[in-house]
C-alpha cells in the first residue's frame, strides 16, 4: 500500500511505545559507541516528527522515507567522525546507499564494558524511581551489543523484563526471585541474538534463495499438515520480516511480524493444530510463541516420495518448468516427513538432488541417470548422526567443562590462528551442545544439535570476518552455508602454523582469580588451555591433561592458602617450569 | 513459461521422408535431454526417441531405429526429427518433451501416412 506519510503510517501501526523503543533499538545497533543520553535525544525528536506527520501527513518532510528521515538524525551526531571514524563517510552518501553504508559498519563484537549487574536493591530503585528509562536503557544496552538482534522479539524481552522487576521488587526475598530471571533472561537473549545473526548472514551473504530454502525445510518440518501453497506463503512473507530487521528496517519488520502473526491465527486450520494456545496470547508473546511452536503431528497417510521425485517420467519437465518451484515441493515434501533431521541436513539433500537433476536431465535417458539418487542421501544422513553419537557419548563420559576442554583442543589444532578470546566463546559455546541436545531422544537430537552447530559457527564466521586471520576458516565459512559444520569437522590439525612463542606472561595468575565466579574461572582456565594448545600444538591429549589438572590443584591450593598472592607467585613459577618440562617447551 | 511448438508434419506416402521441427522457449534448452514420442489415434502415447542436451548421445525405439534421427540446434533452441521410409504404422501425432517425459504439454504435429 503506498502511504503518503511513511513514518505516519508506522506510528499509527504500531503504537507510540513500540514506535520509541523500535526508533531507539535502530540507532543503538547503528551508533554502538553513542551514549544513552544522545539516543533519547534523538530518538524523542524523530517521535515528535512523526507525531506532526500523523497529525498532517502532507507536512513538510512527512513524504521523505525512513532510511532518509533515520539517516539525517544519525548525521546530525557532532561527534560522528571522532567517535565513528570512516562511519562517517556515509553521511556523504544518498540513500540506499547511505543505509548500506551505515549496515556495513555493524559491529559483531563492539569494543564495549562487559555489563556489570548492580545488586538487586541498586536495580529496584533505580527500576522504580524512572521505569521508562530503566527500561529503554535495557533495550538500548542489549541493541549496541548485538547490532542484528531481531527486534520485535526484543520488545518481547524488554516486556519479560519489567515483568521481572515488578514482581520480584516487591518479593520477600528480592534476589532469589529476581536473579534467576535475569539469568534466564540473559541465557535467552544470547540465543536469541545467534539464531538471528545466522538468519542475517543467510540473507546477506548467501541471498534470499539461501534463506527461503532454509525456511521452507523449517516449517514444513513444523507444519506438516500444511500445502505446499501454505507454506509457500509463510516463506514469503517470513522472508520479507527478516529481510526487513536484517537490513535495518526494524518499523517495518516489527508491522509485518505482527500481519504474520495475525495472518497465521486466522488460518490456523489449515497450517496447525499446535497453535491454538500461542494465538491466544497477547501480540508479543503471540509471535514469540508461534516461532518457538512444536512440530504438529505429520500426516498418516503420506506416499513414498519415489513416486513424484524418481519414478515420474515428468521429473525432468516438471525440474524444466519451474526449478525452484519443483526443488521447493521436494524440500516440502522431504522436510514434513524427516521432523528428525537437521535442516541443514535436508539443505544438503536438496542440493544433493537438484545437482543430479542439472547433470542427469542433460542425458538422453533422465532416469537410468538420476533412478539411485536417494542412494546417495544415506552417506549424508549417517554423518551427522555418527557424529552427534560419538560427541553424545564423549560428553556424557567428561560433562560439560571437559567437553568444551575437548573441543577447545580440537578447534585450536584446526584452526590456531583465531584469536584466543574468540576460540574459548565459540568452543564454549560448541560445548554447550551436549547438555542441550544429547538429552533429547534419538529422533530429536540431530536438529538439536546440527542446526544448534550452525548458529555457533556462524559466531565463529561473523567474528573471524572482522578481522580475518585463517584461510581455512574463511573457506568453510565461505563456500557452503549449509556445509560449513561438515567442512570445519573435516578440518586436521593445521600443519602449516608456527607455534606461537611462549610467553610467561600468559601464565601469570593472581589472586583474584579466587574471587570470581566459576564460570569465569573455567573460562580462565581455557584461555590458559587454548594458548598452551597454541604453543604446543603437537601435545597429546594426556598431556595437555597432566598440565591442566596440575594447574587446577595449583589454583585450589593458591586460593586456600593465607597469603595468595606469594603463594600465586612462587607456586606459579613452579608450575610454568614444570609445564613447560611436562610438554618440551 | 515453458512452451514447445511442434511443425512439420504433413500427409507423406509410404516409403517417404518429413522433418520435424520442435522449437523450444521458456526454459533453458541447452541443459535438458529432449525426446519425440507420438500418440496414434486410440493408442497410448508411445516414446520415440531421445537426445541428450549436447546431442552427442542418441537413443531410439526399436519400431524407428535405422529410419529416423533426432538432433538439436542449441543455437536455435530447435529439436528436430528426420523421418525417412515412413510407413502407415508411423501415422501419428508427434510432439517433443522435456526428458522422457510423456505427457503432452503441446499441440503436436500430425504426421499421415497413407497412399
Known amino acids: 500500500d503506498a502511504h503518503k506519510s511513511e513514518v505516519a503510517h508506522r506510528f499509527k501501526d504500531l503504537g507510540e511505545e513500540n514506535f520509541k523503543a523500535l526508533v531507539l533499538i535502530a540507532f543503538a545497533q547503528y551508533l554502538q559507541q553513542c551514549p544513552f543520553e544522545d539516543h533519547v535525544k534523538l530518538v524523542n525528536e524523530v517521535t515528535e516528527f512523526a507525531k506532526t506527520c500523523v497529525a498532517d501527513e502532507s507536512a513538510e518532510n512527512c513524504d521523505k522515507s525512513l532510511h532518509t528521515l533515520f539517516g539525517d538524525k544519525l548525521c546530525t551526531v557532532a561527534t560522528l567522525r571522532e567517535t565513528y571514524g570512516e562511519m562517517a563517510d556515509c553521511c556523504a552518501k544518498q540513500e540506499p546507499e547511505r543505509n548500506e553504508c551505515f549496515l556495513q559498519h555493524k559491529d559483531d563484537n563492539p569494543n564495549l564494558p562487559r555489563l556489570v549487574r548492580p545488586e538487586v536493591d541498586v536495580m529496584c530503585t533505580a527500576f522504580h524511581d524512572n521505569e521508562e528509562t530503566f527500561l529503554k536503557k535495557y533495550l538500548y544496552e542489549i541493541a549496541r551489543r548485538h547490532p542484528y538482534f531481531y527486534a520485535p522479539e526484543l520488545l518481547f524481552f524488554a516486556k519479560r523484563y519489567k515483568a521481572a522487576f515488578t514482581e520480584c521488587c516487591q518479593a520477600a526475598d528480592k534476589a532469589a526471585c529476581l536473579l534467576p530471571k535475569l539469568d534466564e533472561l540473559r541465557d535467552e537473549g544470547k540465543a536469541s541474538s545467534a539464531k538471528q545473526r545466522l538468519k542475517c548472514a543467510s540473507l546477506q551473504k548467501f541471498g534470499e534463495r539461501a534463506f527461503k530454502a532454509w525456511a521452507v525445510a523449517r516449517l514444513s518440518q513444523r507444519f506438516p499438515k500444511a500445502e505446499f501453497a501454505e507454506v509457500s506463503k509463510l516463506v514469503t512473507d517470513l522472508t520479507k520480516v527478516h529481510t526487513e530487521c536484517c537490513h535495518g528496517d526494524l518499523l517495518e519488520c516489527a508491522d509485518d511480524r505482527a500481519d504474520l502473526a495475525k495472518y497465521i491465527c486466522e488460518n490456523q486450520d489449515s497450517i496447525s493444530s499446535k497453535l491454538k494456545e500461542c494465538c491466544e496470547k497477547p501480540l508479543l508473546e503471540k509471535s514469540h510463541c508461534i516461532a518457538e511452536v512444536e512440530n504438529d503431528e505429520m500426516p498418516a497417510d503420506l506416499p513414498s516420495l519415489a513416486a513424484d521425485f524418481v519414478e515420474s517420467k515428468d521429473v525432468c519437465k516438471n525440474y524444466a518448468e519451474a526449478k525452484d518451484v519443483f526443488l521447493g515441493m521436494f524440500l516440502y515434501e522431504y522436510a514434513r516427513r524427516h521432523p528428525d533431521y537437521s535442516v541443514v541436513l535436508l539443505l544438503r539433500l536438496a542440493k544433493t538432488y537438484e545437482t543430479t537433476l542439472e547433470k542427469c536431465c542433460a542425458a538422453a535417458d533422465p532416469h537410468e541417470c538420476y533412478a539411485k539418487v536417494f542412494d546417495e542421501f544415506k552417506p549424508l544422513v549417517e554423518e551427522p548422526q555418527n557424529l552427534i553419537k560419538q560427541n553424545c557419548e564423549l560428553f556424557e563420559q567428561l560433562g560439560e567443562y571437559k567437553f568444551q576442554n575437548a573441543l577447545l583442543v580440537r578447534y585450536t589444532k584446526k584452526v590456531p590462528q583465531v584469536s584466543t578470546p574468540t576460540l574459548v566463546e565459540v568452543s564454549r559455546n560448541l560445548g554447550k551442545v551436549g547438555s542441550k541436545c544429547c538429552k533429547h531422544p534419538e529422533a530429536k537430537r540431530m536438529p538439536c544439535a546440527e542446526d544448534y552447530l550452525s548458529v555457533v559457527l556462524n559466531q565463529l564466521c561473523v567474528l573471524h570476518e572482522k578481522t580475518p586471520v585463517s584461510d581455512r576458516v574463511t573457506k568453510c565459512c565461505t563456500e557452503s552455508l549449509v556445509n560449513r559444520r561438515p567442512c570445519f569437522s573435516a578440518l586436521e590439525v593445521d600443519e602449516t602454523y608456527v607455534p606461537k612463542e611462549f610467553n610467561a606472561e600468559t601464565f601469570t595468575f593472581h589472586a583474584d582469580i579466587c574471587t570470581l565466579s566459576e564460570k569465569e574461572r573455567q573460562i580462565k582456565k581455557q584461555t590458559a588451555l587454548v594458548e598452551l594448545v597454541k604453543h604446543k600444538p603437537k601435545a597429546t591429549k594426556e598431556q595437555l591433561k597432566a598440565v591442566m589438572d596440575d594447574f587446577a590443584a595449583f589454583v585450589e591450593k593458591c586460593c586456600k592458602a593465607d597469603d595468595k598472592e606469594t603463594c600465586f607467585a612462587e607456586e606459579g613459577k613452579k608450575l610454568v617450569a614444570a609445564s613447560q618440562a611436562a610438554l618440551g617447551l | 513459461e515453458v512452451q514447445l511448438l511442434e511443425s512439420g508434419g504433413g500427409l507423406v506416402q509410404p516409403g517417404g521422408s518429413l522433418r520435424l521441427s520442435c522449437a523450444a522457449s521458456g526454459f533453458t534448452f541447452s541443459s535438458f535431454g529432449m525426446s519425440w514420442v507420438r500418440q496414434a489415434p486410440g493408442k497410448g502415447p508411445e516414446w520415440v526417441s531421445a537426445i541428450d542436451s549436447g546431442g552427442a548421445d542418441t537413443r531410439y525405439a526399436e519400431t524407428v531405429k535405422g529410419r529416423f534421427t533426432i538432433s538439436r540446434d542449441n543455437s536455435k533452441n530447435t529439436l528436430y526429427l528426420q523421418m525417412n521410409s515412413l510407413r502407415p504404422e508411423d501415422t501419428a501425432v508427434y510432439y517433443c518433451?522435456?526428458?522422457?517425459?510423456?505427457?503432452?504439454g503441446s499441440q503436436g504435429t500430425l504426421v499421415t501416412v497413407s497412399s
Open positions: 518433451t522435456i526428458g522422457r517425459s510423456t505427457s503432452r
